[in-house]
Amino acid sequence: SSSPTSSASSFSSSAPFLASAVSAQPPLPDQCPALCECSEAARTVKCVNRNLTEVPTDLPAYVRNLFLTGNQLAVLPAGAFARRPPLAELAALNLSGSRLDEVRAGAFEHLPSLRQLDLSHNPLADLSPFAFSGSNASVSAPSPLVELILNHIVPPEDERQNRSFEGMVVAALLAGRALQGLRRLELASNHFLYLPRDVLAQLPSLRHLDLSNNSLVSLTYVSFRNLTHLESLHLEDNALKVLHNGTLAELQGLPHIRVFLDNNPWVCDCHMADMVTWLKETEVVQGKDRLTCAYPEKMRNRVLLELNSADLDCDPILPPSLQTS
């Protein structure tokens, strides 16, 4: 993942420095929030694994990298990071694993430099459509976000609202066309069954898309045509059975693309012929020699690249009424 990584080897904490006897009061007040560690030189604040229930109000204005991981934030309200003066330099915000279940409209407003946001490993039962756009206007002000990391944000089944989780996430990605500048989108490990057909067309700047470890069965209705800048497409560990001609042609037409397809239950029957032919010719699939059949049983573990048309047959399927004798 491309979440903001640790950028300073050591950090000054908000605890006062102790002299041998009594601690001398520093001449200028410490600007590091309680329960956080700060490095002014790295412009980094870390409030990690401290069971914080809200975002500290006294974040220093110099912060560029903010880690709020491993806390118990529960809800991120509107303007959660709005400050006076604003956190004008905050560029990377990592909120992963902080037990967030609700992110409200405008939660990330007033962060004009925010380029990288990681909300991974939070059970987001309620992600507002306007979490990233900040307003319900049909066209919002462009978000500065370039990387959005949303791996494993699916809540447990009993906590889900009565609506499609895929739909909720996509609504937030598309609201107000605010994320037109997004270059990296990670949506791994979210139990996605499908990808709404319009989502990719409205994220034209994408370079990296990670949909690995989901439950995608088909890409039939997904169009990659507009993603001319796409460099990597991660589809490992899904439930894909076959890629059809339309998808193959679109992927082949992307000038910079690398596609990752490992660990999918490929069905090696007559419908797989086009994909096998394409795999043998294409350079876009990374590790294509590792792709193997899962079904039918007689084909299990056969390497796709080693198949020929004679291997790919479809047994005639009788209508149910004719299957009993």
């Epitope: 950028s7 300073a8 080897s9 050591s10 950090f11 000054s12 420095f17 002299a19 520093p26 001449p27 200028l28 600007q31 700060c38 490095s39 002014e40 030189a41 790295a42 412009r43 220093p60 204005a61 110099y62």
Partner: antibody
Framework: EVQLRQSGPVLVKPGASLKMSCKAS????????MTWVTQSHGQSLDWIGL????????TYNQKFKGKATLSVDKSSNTAYMDLNSLTSEDSAVYYC????????????WGRGTSVTVSS | ENVLTQSPAIMSASPGEKVTMTCSAS?????MHWYQQKSSTSPKVWIY???KLASGVPGRFSGSGSGNSYSLTISSMEAEDVATYYC?????????FGGGTKLEIK
């Protein structure tokens, strides 16, 4: 307790170079910008430059570009300043100080290194 | 460069007397800091962000001002206040100090 311990006084000949040190204790130098200031005898203070020990990036007062070079050794928690092509005009006390980014000010200062340039 | 001009350069005050010194900036700044330096010692931050007293600074000191004009005031002069006071701006490069106001006691 935060302390900045500077190297002792030096007498050098014109044209020579020298490297003075500023050892920090009570905090990690990599976490704070460090700055250097000079004061000629009985005169005002003059800002020389600033170093970000985390990135190594430096910013100099144009007046001291080519004269002073700032560096840091994070492993020993020490900041350094090199002065080259010394003349009698460079005779002064040189202070290191910790810069506070949120305040745009220095909070802790060393005691200064006295430099005398004389033949 | 933002030139800071302090006045007066030297002043003396009797114990208990009110003292005011000023610092004029050639370009507007949002904050001014003040440092106190006693003879043969390094400077100490005295007032920061125009009006906030650094830790340990007596309450008789105050700072004010905005834009191009700032001042430091001592409400009641005491012997331990004898020092040189420098204004300083750390917003625009190069950072600059004023020429100092040397405060003596009568």
């Amino acid at each position: 307790e935060v302390q900045l311990r500077q190297s002792g006084p030096v007498l050098v000949k014109p044209g020579a170079s020298l490297k003075m040190s500023c050892k920090a204790s009570g905090f990690t130098i990599a976490d704070y910008y460090m700055t250097w200031v000079t004061q000629s005898h009985g005169q005002s203070l003059d800002w020389i430059g600033l170093i970000n020990p985390y990135s190594g990036e430096t910013t100099y007062n144009q007046k001291f570009k080519g004269k002073a070079t700032l560096s840091v050794d994070k492993s020993s928690n020490t900041a350094y300043m090199d002065l080259n092509s010394l003349t009698s005009e460079d005779s002064a006390v040189y202070y290191c100080a910790r810069w506070r980014l949120g305040y745009y000010a220095m909070d802790y200062w060393g005691r200064g290194t006295s430099v005398t340039v004389s033949s | 460069e933002n030139v800071l001009t302090q006045s007066p350069a030297i002043m003396s005050a009797s114990p208990g007397e009110k003292v005011t010194m000023t610092c004029s900036a050639s370009s507007s700044v949002s904050y001014m800091h003040w440092y106190q330096q006693k003879s043969s010692t390094s400077p100490k931050v005295w007032i920061y962000d125009t009006s906030k007293l650094a830790s340990g600074v007596p309450g008789r000191f105050s700072g004010s001002g905005s834009g191009n004009s700032y001042s430091l005031t001592i409400s009641s002069m005491e012997a331990e206040d004898v020092a040189t006071y420098y204004c300083f701006q750390g917003i625009g490069y190069p950072y600059t100090f004023g020429g100092g106001t040397k405060l003596e006691i009568k």
